[in-house]
């Protein structure tokens, strides 16, 4: 669904300030595209609220309109509040707008609970915190909508930012990344560092923090330490992936490698938990059960419903354990694998219980529609999403949470053969690459 | 069927220690299936929830009484039992203990509770 | 905090008619929400599990309704041993340990 599982998502607070970060490893990776080393006027430009979406500031129209637009990578719509709705504070007037050009054309985009519809035109956008460019790209102006917007969220709008494949209404709409490397000199490649706060937040920390970075155009080395491992983009459309294994703290789920790929498996910033499809969902919750088995949580938690409380600071973390995720490499029958802890897959719900307490939820859901890799993998790493060389890069976050026993990890490499076989093909039949919900 | 029995003393005096057990009849404490707990009610109030136990030993406790609360058990006894220190008037109150099923979520087994009487 | 308000305080009606008691959650519960009934100088007994389902033993006469923050426990048609104190409580925060304030239903 639209709400509480794709979106609302979370953020929280960011890693120590950049002159605390831990320093990057050297490594002998081969060169990349993009300037390389400091983004600085990039660093820090996202935000958010715990569950509500990582949102960076955009400016829209002559004179620039400023509004906060939800970062999302498993969509392809620039899309954005184009009316009043109770839940905008604000919202883009094409009227004002002297370079708004009408496409003459609706956008209609349902999802499996909720949906939004609007106008087809383009504008000038800039990203102020982001390169120096202003660039002509579509926009869809969103006229009505169902549980689309959220209450308290403070973003008005969302950046699709995955291939042309899946925009709406088809794949002719250009979306904005395309546009943008189109018109400047832009390398295409860009990278998120998504900052979860690990503690539940008051309202007030809520408001004020900050959630990451997206750097666009290159890689930051001080936003990860250690070294970048790659896996292919199997195909330009979402940014899917292949696992070719799955571990929780070490043991092998053991499952046929095409299981975990059913019916794809992306890369999306914008869905909050780790999605895994039925059968894999199943057997990872019975693995992760076994191995918390000296505490025993109720069958909502595991659903994703109930939250289960401890005293403040008191999480017993160490009962939880790790998840990897392996993914196949760029190497021939070569593997590299994202390790995440409970700091990760538990998400801080605030307001809920009473301040003595620290609340969470189980941020690992059963999918339909495949694996998605949303904020509970994400928050661990930084992701460099390399459009120039269709490959997604994974380095341990340096603001990832963790504590002094564990911290995620990125390891390899590891051999694994006959990974081209857990790549699951959607017969041509099959309508579910129309499928805009991602129940 | 399963039955649950609290027993200890009626009457505690002021800044002294509560302590009562409650008896698990017709089943296993041990069953892998329950949580147990424990629940008050002053005379004439609502209801209270003090604390759970699973049989392995893990706890949670209401946390404007976990600095006085102790609630342990012993699977040999079939028994799980509860201890609250420096008692108060504020104390004073039918305690019940009771089990957590339905996925761990509803008490939906209670024992008949007792009076304790935190008094001088 | 969840806060779990229960209205009315004081329900009187005479013995056949319909009893309807609310409980309203400060914020969002979900479904995850018990009723108990309990009888003086008894323990309370479970009704109600995940807002709408009889736990074992219970009469069909109880029944539960409601998601998200208003509930609602309605006796179709009461019964003499029906008279007593009715208790909600949410379990959507676990450990579960917020009741409401009770409803007692009276012999009018």
């Known amino acids: 669904t639209h709400l509480g599982i794709r979106l609302p998502l979370r953020s929280g607070l960011a890693g120590p300030p950049l002159g605390l970060r831990l320093p990057r490893e050297t490594d002998e990776e081969s060169e990349e595209p993009g300037r390389r080393g400091s983004f600085v006027e990039m660093v820090d430009n996202l935000r958010g609220k715990s569950g509500q979406g990582y949102y960076v500031e955009m400016t829209v129209g002559s004179p620039p309109q400023t509004l906060n637009i939800l970062v999302d990578t498993g969509s392809s719509n620039f899309a954005v509040g184009a009316a009043p709705h109770p839940f905008l504070h604000r919202y883009y007037q094409r009227q004002l707008s002297s370079t708004y050009r009408d496409l003459r054309k609706g956008v209609y985009v349902p999802y499996t609970q909720g949906k939004w519809e609007g106008e087809l035109g383009t504008d000038l956008v800039s990203i102020p915190h982001g390169p120096n460019v202003t660039v002509r790209a579509n926009i869809a102006a969103i006229t009505e909508s169902d549980k689309f917007f959220i209450n308290g969220s403070n973003w008005e709008g969302i950046l699709g930012l995955a291939y042309a494949e899946i925009a709406r209404p088809d794949d002719s709409l250009e979306p904005f990344f395309d546009s943008l490397v189109k018109q400047t000199h832009i390398p295409n490649i860009f990278s998120l560092q998504l900052c979860g706060a690990g503690f539940p937040l008051n309202q007030t920390e809520a408001l004020a923090s900050v959630g990451g970075s997206m750097i666009i155009g290159g890689i930051d080395h001080s936003l990860y330490t250690g070294r970048l491992w790659y896996t292919p983009i199997r195909r330009e459309w979402y940014y899917e992936v292949i696992i070719v294994r799955v571990e929780i703290n070490g043991q092998d789920l053991k499952m046929d490698c095409k299981e975990y790929n059913y019916d794809k498996s992306i890369v999306d910033s914008g869905t909050t938990n780790l999605r895994l499809p039925k059968k894999v969902f199943e057997a990872a919750v019975k693995s992760i059960k076994a191995a918390s088995s000296t505490e025993k949580f109720p069958d909502g938690f595991w659903l994703g419903e109930q939250l289960v409380c401890w005293q403040a600071g008191t999480t017993p973390w160490n009962i939880f354990p790790v998840i990897s995720l392996y993914l196949m490499g760029e190497v021939t029958n070569q593997s590299f694998r994202i390790t995440i802890l409970p700091q990760q897959y538990l998400r801080p719900v605030e307001d809920v219980a009473t301040s003595q307490d620290d609340c969470y939820k189980f941020a690992v859901s059963q999918s339909s529609t495949g694996t998605v890799m949303g904020a509970v993998i994400m928050e661990g790493f930084y992701v460099v999403f390399d459009r120039a060389r269709k490959r997604i890069g994974f380095a341990v976050s340096a603001c990832h949470v963790h504590d002094e026993f564990r911290t995620a990890a990125v390891e390899g490499p590891f051999v694994t053969a006959d990974m081209e076989d857990c790549g699951y093909n959607i017969p041509q039949t099959d309508e579910s690459t129309l499928m805009t919900g991602r129940a | 069927q399963l039955q649950l029995q609290e027993s200890g003393p009626g009457l505690v005096k002021p800044s002294e220690t509560l302590s009562l057990t409650c008896t698990v009849s017709?089943?296993?404490?041990?069953?892998?299936?329950?949580?147990w707990g424990w629940i008050r009610q002053p005379p004439g109030k609502g209801l209270e929830w003090i604390g759970n136990i699973y049989y392995s030993g893990s706890t949670y406790y209401n946390p404007s009484l976990k600095s006085r609360v102790t609630i342990s058990v012993d699977t040999s006894k079939n028994q799980f039992s509860l201890k609250l220190s420096s008692v108060t008037a504020a104390d004073t109150a039918v305690y019940y203990c009771?089990?957590?099923?339905?996925?761990?979520?509803?008490?939906?087994?209670w024992g008949r509770g007792t009076l304790v009487t935190v008094s001088s | 905090e969840i806060v779990l308000t229960q209205s009315p305080a004081t329900l009187s009606l005479s013995p056949g008619e319909r009893a309807t008691l609310s409980c309203r959650a400060s914020?969002?519960?979900?479904?995850?929400l018990a009723w108990f009934q309990q009888k003086p100088g008894q323990a309370p007994r479970l009704l109600i599990y995940?807002?709408?389902n009889r736990a074992t033993g219970i009469p069909a006469r109880f029944s539960g309704s409601g998601s998200g923050t208003d509930f609602t426990l309605t006796i179709s048609s009461l019964e003499p041993e029906d008279f007593a104190v009715y208790y909600c409580q949410q379990v959507y925060v676990w450990p579960p340990r917020t009741f409401g304030g009770g409803t007692k239903v009276e012999i009018k």
């Open positions: 009771a089990r957590l099923g339905h996925g761990y979520s509803y008490f939906d087994l």
């Open positions: 017709g089943g296993s404490i041990s069953s892998s299936s329950y949580y």
């Open positions: 995940d807002a709408s």
């Open positions: 914020q969002s519960v979900s479904s995850y």
